[in-house]
Structures are given as C-alpha cells and as structure tokens.
C-alpha cells in the first residue's frame, strides 16, 4: 500500500459511519484545500496549524444514490476524456477537445492524464492561459500532452523520486509521494486520484503544469531579482553545482533578503570561504520538497549539514519558524525553487557570539558593555558558557563593573570546546586564567556548580552552551570551606578528631554531605566524649557522609533515587525533588557549594547507614537521640570495622642517601655530575573504590602504563644535584579496601639519553609528584636529622630555587 | 547595459545644501541598492551610506549622519543624496555606485563635482 | 586619514608583475572581505576584485586578490600601460560601522 492509499483508507474509517464508501476529507477554513484525513491531522483538528471543518464526500471511485445513505454506488467507467467529465474536470475535458486531443483520449491506449481542477485553470495566469486559448492546435495541444503519460499509472505506481517522460517532447514529470499521503507532479497535488478509465486513468491536480526545460542554474542566472544570491553562489564555487542532474530544493533569498543581513555580517561571511559556502550549501536540500507536500512541521537536512525545519500557516511555508516564502514551487529540471525574503544562517556560519538566542541576551550585552566582545577575534577560537537571562540577579548586575568582568571572564573559554568534546574529569582554562572543572552525569553536564542546559551550538569561530546558573570556580577546600562557616563548627571539630582533617584539605574529588550544628542539637559534652572516644565508631560515621566523585545536586537525574557508594562502604540515597535534594530522604537546606576538591550539600541531620548495627548501649543512646529518621540496630558486642588508613590518606616515606659528586672541570665553571641513586623517594596514594572487600578476600588490580622518568637538579646543602623520579605502574595484591591509584616513584641516575627517550614518549602522562612544586627542598636541620637516621617529622617547603638548565625539563612538563 | 547618470556639477556657500540625482538604466532598479561615495580633490574615496532601491532603508556612515540623507524614485529609476549645511571641505566630486551587497560598488555613475566656495 | 594603510606608490615595467599591498586591523580586514577598486586618470573607479579573489566579470584575469589576517594585497601580472591608475582597497569596519577605503596606490607603468 502507498502513503496515499493508506491515508485514503483513514479517511474511509473516518468517513463510514456516515454510511458505505464514504471519505473523511479536512478543509482548511476559509480556503478551498481540501485534504483526505491523516490521523495526526484528524485528531489535531488542524492542517498547517489552521482549523478545520470535515466534509464527508463518496470516496474515489463511488457515488450516491437517491434515498440511500452513503455512497453505494459505483462510478461509471468511461475512457478518459468521458472520465474528465466524471471527476468534474470539465475545463480540460473542453481543452481536450478544441485541441483535437479528444480523440486521441477516446480510442485506443492507454494513458495516465494528470488533469488540472477548473479553479487551476482559473488560477492561471491569465497571459498565459489567453495564449493558449489563442494557438490551441499547438500551444494548447503541447501543453496538455505535458500533462499525460503513455500508460495507466495508478498513486500506487507513483513512487516518491520518480521522473516520467510526458507525452510532450519526454518533458519529465517529477513524481514525489510524501508520507503524509500527498503526492505531487512537479509540484501540483493529486487532489483526487486513480479515476479509472477503459483506457488509462486519470488524476486530478490543484495547478496547470508549466513546461520545464530549465535548470535551477538556469533559473538562477535569468532573474534579476536574485543576483545577490547568483553572485554569492558563484563567491562559493555553488552555481555550477545547481546545474547538475538532481532533485533539489533551494530556498533562494531574494535581494532583499539580502539587504536585510546587517551589513557587517554580509561583509564577514562574505569573506570567508568556509562560512560563505556553508552560508549558500544551508538554502539547498538533497530532496524535492513541493509546498503543498508541507502540512505540518518537519525537518530536512540541508546541503550544509545541518536541518532547518520547514512547516506552514494557511497558504504560507515557514522556515526555522519564520514565513518568509514569498514565492513557491518553481519547477525547474532537476528540483524545485521557493523564493524566499530572509537569509537563512547556518551556525556554521556564525560568529561565536552570534550563536546566542533570546534567552541569553543577558549574557551577550554585558560581554559587549564590559569590552569582552572586542577579545573574540573572527581568527580565535572560543567558548561561551552562557547562563541564561534569569542567573543574572539585580545584585549581581549590579556589582562593580571589574567585578562583573572577572564573572563574565569565568564564561569564556580560550579554545573551542563542543558539547561532544566534554568529558567528566576535564579542566578547561577560561580568557581570566581560571580553571574550571567538567562532572559529566547521566543526564546533566555540568562546569563547576551550574549544569547546562539544552541549545549547544558550534559556530565558525567557537561553540556555546547555556548554563542555569552564573559558574562560580571554586576557591577553597572542602576542610577550608568548613572551617569558615560557623554551621558546621561541630561537624568540623569531629572530623578532627577523627583525624580525618587531612582528608577535606588535600586535592580530590569528594561530595560531602555536611551536617550543621542543628544535626548535634541535645549532644552534652559527655556525650561528645562518648562519641569521640570511639574511633572507629566516629570514622564510620564521619566518612558516611563523605562520597568519592563531585556529585551536583542539578546532576542528579530527576524524580529518581540515586544509589552513591560513600567512603565508609555503606549506601547513601540522593533524590532530585523540584530543585531539592532529598539525601536519605531527608531535605538538603543547602546544595552545590563548590569546594576545590569537591561539593558540599547541608543537611541538618546527622546521616547513619542503617545497614550498620551499634553494640555499645552509650552510643546507641546518643545516635537514637540524634537520629530520629531510621531505627538503628542493635547487637551487642558488635563493633565497626576499622576503616584503613590508606583509603583516604596519602603516606609519604623519604630516604635520602648522601650522593657520589664527581666534578668535571670546564672552561667557565665546573659542571657537577651525579652518579649513583640520589634520592628514593616511595610514594603511596590511595583512593577509594566502591567496592568494599570482605576479610580474607584479596585483589589484584593491574594499572596500567610504562615507567615514567623525570629528570631535574635540586639543591642539597648547596649542592647541586641531578634526580630522576622512575614513575612505574605495576600489579599489585592488596587486601582490605581496595586502593584505586597505587603509585610507586623511586629515584635512580638515568642517562639523559633514556630521559630524552621517556620523555618523548610518556610526555602526556606526566604528572606532578613531588608537593610543593619547583625545587621542593628540606631545611637543613631537617636533612641532617635524616642523614643521622631519623625520620623527618615533616616535609618542609623549598627556600632556595632548582638552578641552571636543567629547570627547564621540569617546567616543560604537563602539571 | 548598465548605466548610472549624475546630475551636473554644483556651487554651494557653505551652511546651504546640495542634492545630487543618479538615474539608473540598463537593470531592475528596485533590485540592487545604491551606495554613495565621495572624493575630495587628490584624495582618497570615502563612502557616505546606502539606500535600499527596494524599500527605503538606509544606512549611513557615522560621520555624516543627521547631515545627510538618501532617498529614491522607484517611477523614474532615480537616486538622491542630499547634504546639508556644507562646509568647504565637502567640496568633492560625489560618485553613485550600484551596490547590490554581495557584490560591493560594482557599476558607478560619472561623478557630480560640488563645489563648495563663499 | 585612511583606516587601511597602503603603499603611495608602486612601478615595474612592462609585462612584469607588480603587487599593491592593504594593511588594517581585527576590526576591517581581520574581520570581514576586501575588495579592490581601479580608478583610472580622470574617471570614475572600478570594481576589480571582490571577496578577497572574486574577479567580476570583464576584469582579466591578470588581476588577482588574496587575504591574510589584517592584510590583503593586489597582484598585476603581465603588466600594461592601461593599467596605470590609481587602486584603492576597501573593508567594511566593524567599529565604525563603516565601509573604509585605503588611501590609494598609484601604479605607474615604466
């Protein structure tokens, strides 16, 4: 069955309880288009987003009878001049016979006569049609025969793509059968089909077809009123393109629509090869598309690579939204021409800033007031990250200009960054020098505190993605973040006490769920001590509120629960509820405080795993007093686990071993070269995983990767001398929790050569190890005490610089 | 072919106005635009705005906006600019060009000489 | 004073090739196309180049444009007496919102 055999069979279901082989049809109010009912139009009630009324006619083929209901009746079959008289096609049928056609349509053959409606005759210009009327044994005869086919085509033969030779010199007939049920010749309706004659069939259509012998170049090249648009096409290498074999559509601006186009946007595009090629290849579609094919909206792809949706008003074609077709269906050779009164601009074609629609005016003005605009060069390549209209408050608006420029300076990135470029974990450098991070989620994206939302665009010069909220990069740690906010005074002196400072003040990535003083609410001092003397107990609680990962509340997928792993093993449960976060089914007071090494969401109570049962009757006396929301168990004796310390902390042990320095005399001053190991240096981080393993169970973790040398001088009690750090990445057995980055870096005397080689190849996986940066060195004191044998209490930061060359293999690095 | 015609040289005092016609031949006026360009005496071409042949709209260069002002005559195929309160360093030679955008400028009139004397 | 800046001069002789240099900034030809005008003694000018290379036509192909960042340059090859005028280039300036023409080069033929 074809589209329009199908939609003929709705308009039967629609149409049969007014009685047998009768047809739903859909007439556009205040026109005379009528449509056989599709199904997305029948419940609309609409076709081109115009009312309806629904007329009942006798299908195709069927007539009424007096006194019956429907349409029970057969239509009599005749040949195929008899059938224009049958289907009402009466103007063609005396067309037919002025033009001594009628007996050719009488006698023997078989023929398919696409037969124009009398109100398409009417409809024809009337130059045109006098001149016809004037030469009908001709010009008349031509003109009909162009409208025939030398054999029955039924709308089931009428494939969509199809070019059919006409009666009339082979002149094509351009077949299109569109989904929606229409099917056009060169571009006119098939407003009633498949009128089966004795010797063919006849189809009626909505306009009198025009002869073509003409491409779209052609076409192009002869009317003035596109010599902007030849002219461009020619700027564009296109012209000659539009001259091929094909079925095209080309929506072609006029010279007004030219002169439309800001003029400094025409100059630039006009410039640029890319943009100007991209600009003319976004008017062009592959396909042939027949305005009356359009009763709804729909996207193509254009030439470009990119869709424009195409949809209509009444007897107006829009484009992207917008009518602008002045001009429909001009048939030429090898598709079909609308003449329309804007440009249309592809984002491709688009400067980065031009890129912003009506919901991020905010943004782009202020870029523009705050002399931003000027540091997008046409020659760079940016990023807008641009919050939409309402992230900007009145207070924010209203801050000191240098202020609100260091903000904006905060939305703009140096490269251009598209959205299939963003990766959870990624750091990209904004024009004011900031760095900002990625947390790519199931169903958000989000830079730093504010997730996008939906309208990315990549345009000539740059992309751009809209944010909710105005990106904030976070200035302090976690710890920091605490420690400065009196609500969190009790939390913080816990966590101290848990010895777990460390852990919130050093780099990484955490989601803390910080409970506030309210949480403690009742706790004596006593009781404090209860919890506090409990070690074990208070690290348990403590890191259930921590989770590895930066979770944003916005990226949390909405309306469902989501499963996180916290650092003490058991689960914690987030929910996403009209802009609050429900963590165990509690509310968050206050969500996506950004941290440098994570996020804090407050809550004001104290979170438990309830999976974990206490056995100390005292504690269980002040969690019960603390935690109303769970009933938490109880088995006596039971004690909780000891959480190792490797899973959250990062142990550094330091030998140094006094070097061999042997002294090579120069010309200007002696070069020092070292021999032997100069330092070791065994360095163990770890992180959590997920996954907690049980006693007994071991596990073997292979990470990957090859050995890693770092060479560089330090300076030791005045000494210069030469280290290299061996990063080397090898399986290991761990039991207990499971460490997800084991690092080992040992130092060792590698030829500059092997340096130079390493380097070369491992260049992107260097990372820094040693804290403290550049030429981090130890008090003398301290060197000394290790010389003697004993451990240094701590590292001690550098005061004196990495000398000479060799500092520029450091900084040469990756950080 | 294309053909602009300038009305004929002019001499102004300074403070009085001068308006220049272009009658366009050869194409479809409405079509294409007409910008105007000016050249003082060994000088260089400095452009003084745009008129629409289509509709009307204008664009002016900032220099000489609310002293200047272009209109057409889509009956007769005819371009005017008029200047305003003149000053001696007006007096140039005042060329009309077609100017259809895409392509910039690319037929011109003979050139009017205004002369601008007390 | 002209935005664009070029060369007063330049010369070569007959059936040589001689280059007409456009210098501008980010704003006109960092920006947007250049185009070429030839305005022989005593008449009106004359489009030569469009779009930084496009040739309208008429114009031989002895003319040849090119763009690059905020400069642009014209190049005579075959050089001919016709060809003594004077050649202004000419961006749109985004800042002034302007159509800026160079201050002119005059080409003589030796």
């Known amino acids: 069955n074809s589209y329009y055999d199908k939609v003929l069979a709705h308009s039967r279901i629609r149409g049969r309880d007014q009685g047998p082989n009768v047809c739903a049809l859909q007439q556009i109010l205040g026109t005379k288009k009528k449509y056989f009912s599709s199904c997305k139009n029948w419940y609309q009630g609409a076709i081109c987003g115009k009312k309806t009324t629904v007329l009942y006619e006798c299908c195709p083929g069927y007539m009424r009878m007096e006194g019956m209901k429907g349409c029970p009746a057969v239509m009599p079959i005749d040949h195929v001049y008899g059938t224009l008289g049958i289907v009402g096609a009466t103007t063609t049928q005396h067309y037919s016979d002025v033009s001594k056609l009628r007996e050719e349509i009488e006698g023997k053959g078989s023929y398919t006569y696409f037969a124009p409606s009398n109100e398409a005759w009417d409809n024809l210009d009337s130059d045109i049609r006098r001149g016809l009327e004037n030469n009908v044994n001709v010009e008349l005869l031509n003109a009909l025969h162009s409208h025939m086919v030398n054999k029955r085509m039924l709308t089931k033969d009428l494939k969509h793509g199809m070019v059919i030779p006409s009666m009339y010199n082979n002149l094509g007939l351009f077949i299109n059968h569109y989904p929606n049920g229409v099917v056009t010749v060169n571009c006119a309706r098939v407003i009633h089909g498949n009128q089966i004659a004795t010797n063919g069939v006849v189809h009626v259509i909505d306009r009198v077809l025009t002869q073509i012998g003409t491409s779209i170049q052609d076409f192009i090249e002869a009317e003035d009123e596109l010599s902007s648009f030849r002219a461009a096409a020619i700027t564009s290498d296109l012209l000659e393109s539009l001259g091929r074999d094909g079925h095209f559509t080309l929506f072609a601006p006029t010279n007004e629509a030219f002169e439309k186009l800001p003029r400094g946007v025409l100059e630039r595009i006009m410039g640029d090869k890319v943009a100007s090629e991209a600009l003319m290849k976004y008017h062009i579609l592959n396909t042939l598309q027949c305005s009356e094919a359009i009763t709804g909206g729909a996207v193509f792809e254009t030439m470009e690579g990119n869709t424009i949706e195409i949809g209509c008003e009444g007897d107006s074609i829009s484009i992207n939204g917008i009518k602008m077709v002045n001009k429909k269906d001009i048939v030429t050779k090898n598709g079909v021409i609308h003449l329309i009164d804007e440009v249309l601009i592809p984002d491709s074609a688009k400067q980065v800033i031009e890129l912003a629609g009506k919901q991020q005016t905010t943004f782009t003005d202020l870029v523009a007031q705050l002399g931003l605009a000027s540091s997008l060069k046409p020659d760079g390549e940016y990023t807008l990250l641009a919050p939409v209209n309402n992230a900007f408050s009145d207070d924010t608006l209203s801050m000191d200009q240098r202020l609100l420029k260091l903000i904006l300076q905060n939305h703009i990135l140096k490269v251009k960054v598209g959205l299939s470029d963003l990766y959870n974990g990624q750091i990209l450098e904004t024009i004011g020098g900031k760095q900002l991070r990625v947390f790519v989620y199931r169903t958000a994206i989000c830079i730093e505190n504010s997730c996008m939302v939906r309208g990315s665009k990549q345009g000539r010069n740059g992309a751009i993605h809209i944010f909710r909220e105005i990106i904030q990069p976070a200035e302090k740690s976690l710890h920091e973040k605490l420690r400065q906010d009196k609500r969190f005074s009790i939390f913080l002196s816990l966590l101290e006490a848990a010895d777990l400072k460390d852990l919130l003040t050093q780099p990484g990535d955490w989601t803390l769920f910080a409970p506030t003083n309210d949480a403690f609410k009742g706790m004596t001092n006593e009781e404090r001590e209860i919890l506090i003397g409990d070690k074990n107990a208070l690290q348990n609680i403590i890191l259930y509120h921590l989770t590895p990962g930066v979770y944003i509340g916005k990226g949390f997928e909405p309306g469902v629960t989501n499963i996180l792993k916290t650092t003490q093993g058991s689960k914690i449960y987030v929910k996403g509820v009209n802009e609050t976060l429900l963590v165990n089914e509690l509310k968050s007071k206050e969500s996506d405080i950004m941290t440098t090494n994570g996020v804090i969401h407050v809550v004001d109570k104290l979170l438990y795993p309830a999976d974990i049962p206490v056995g100390n009757d005292q504690l269980l006396e002040l969690l019960n007093k603390l935690i109303k929301y769970i009933q938490i168990k109880f088995v006596r004796g039971s004690t909780f686990k000891e959480i190792p310390m490797t899973v959250y902390t990062t142990k550094i042990i330091t030998k140094l071993v006094e070097p061999k320095i042997k002294v090579i005399q120069g010309s200007l001053q002696p070069i020092i070269k070292t021999e032997g190991p100069a330092m070791t240096k065994i360095h163990i981080e770890g992180e959590p995983d997920f996954r907690l393993i049980k006693e007994g169970e071991t596990v073997t973790e292979v990470i990957h990767g090859e050995p890693v040398i770092k060479k560089y001088t330090k300076i030791i009690d005045g000494v210069p001398v030469e280290i290299t750090e061996k990063e080397t990445r090898e399986e290991r057995i761990i039991t207990g929790p499971e460490i997800k980055y084991t690092r080992i870096s040992t130092g060792g005397g590698e030829t500059e050569e092997t340096l130079q080689k390493f380097l070369q190849k491992e260049v992107s996986k260097v990372t820094k190890f040693i804290e403290g940066g550049d030429g981090h060195l130890f008090e003398d004191e301290a060197i000394k005490r290790l010389l003697q044998g004993d451990t240094p209490a701590k590292k001690i930061q550098a005061n004196k610089r990495v000398q000479g060359s060799r500092r520029r293999s450091r900084e040469g690095r990756s950080q | 072919q294309v053909q602009l015609v300038q009305s004929g040289a002019e001499v102004k005092k300074p403070g009085a106005s001068v308006k220049v016609s272009c009658k366009a031949s050869g194409y479809t006026f409405t079509s294409y635009g007409i910008s105007w360009v000016r050249q003082a005496p060994g000088q260089g071409l400095e452009w003084m705005g745009w008129?629409?042949?289509?509709?009307?709209?204008?664009n002016y260069a900032q220099k000489l906006q609310g002293r200047v002002t272009m209109t057409t005559d889509t009956s007769t195929s005819t371009a005017y600019m008029e200047l305003r309160s003149l000053r001696s360093d007006d007096t140039a030679v005042y060329y009309c060009?077609?100017?259809?955008?895409?392509?910039?400028?690319?037929?011109w009139g003979q050139g009017t000489l205004v002369t601008v004397s007390s | 004073q002209s935005v664009l800046t070029q060369s007063s001069s330049a010369s070569g002789t007959p059936g040589q090739t001689v280059t007409v240099s456009c210098s501008g900034s980010?704003?006109?030809?960092?920006?947007?196309?250049v185009n070429w005008y030839q305005q022989l003694p005593g008449t009106a000018p004359k489009l030569l180049i469009y779009?930084?290379?496009q040739r309208p036509s008429g114009v031989p192909d002895r003319f040849s444009g090119s763009k690059s960042g905020t400069s642009a340059s014209l190049a005579i090859s075959g050089l001919q007496s016709a060809d003594e005028a004077d050649y202004y280039c000419?961006?749109?300036?985004?800042?002034?919102?302007?159509?800026?023409f160079g201050s002119g080069t005059k080409v003589t033929v030796l």
């Open positions: 008129i629409s042949a289509y509709n009307g709209n204008t």
């Open positions: 779009s930084n290379d």
């Open positions: 060009a077609r100017d259809m955008l895409v392509v910039p400028f690319d037929y």
């Open positions: 000419a961006a749109w300036d985004d800042s002034l919102s302007t159509y800026v």
């Open positions: 980010s704003s006109d030809i960092g920006s947007n196309r």
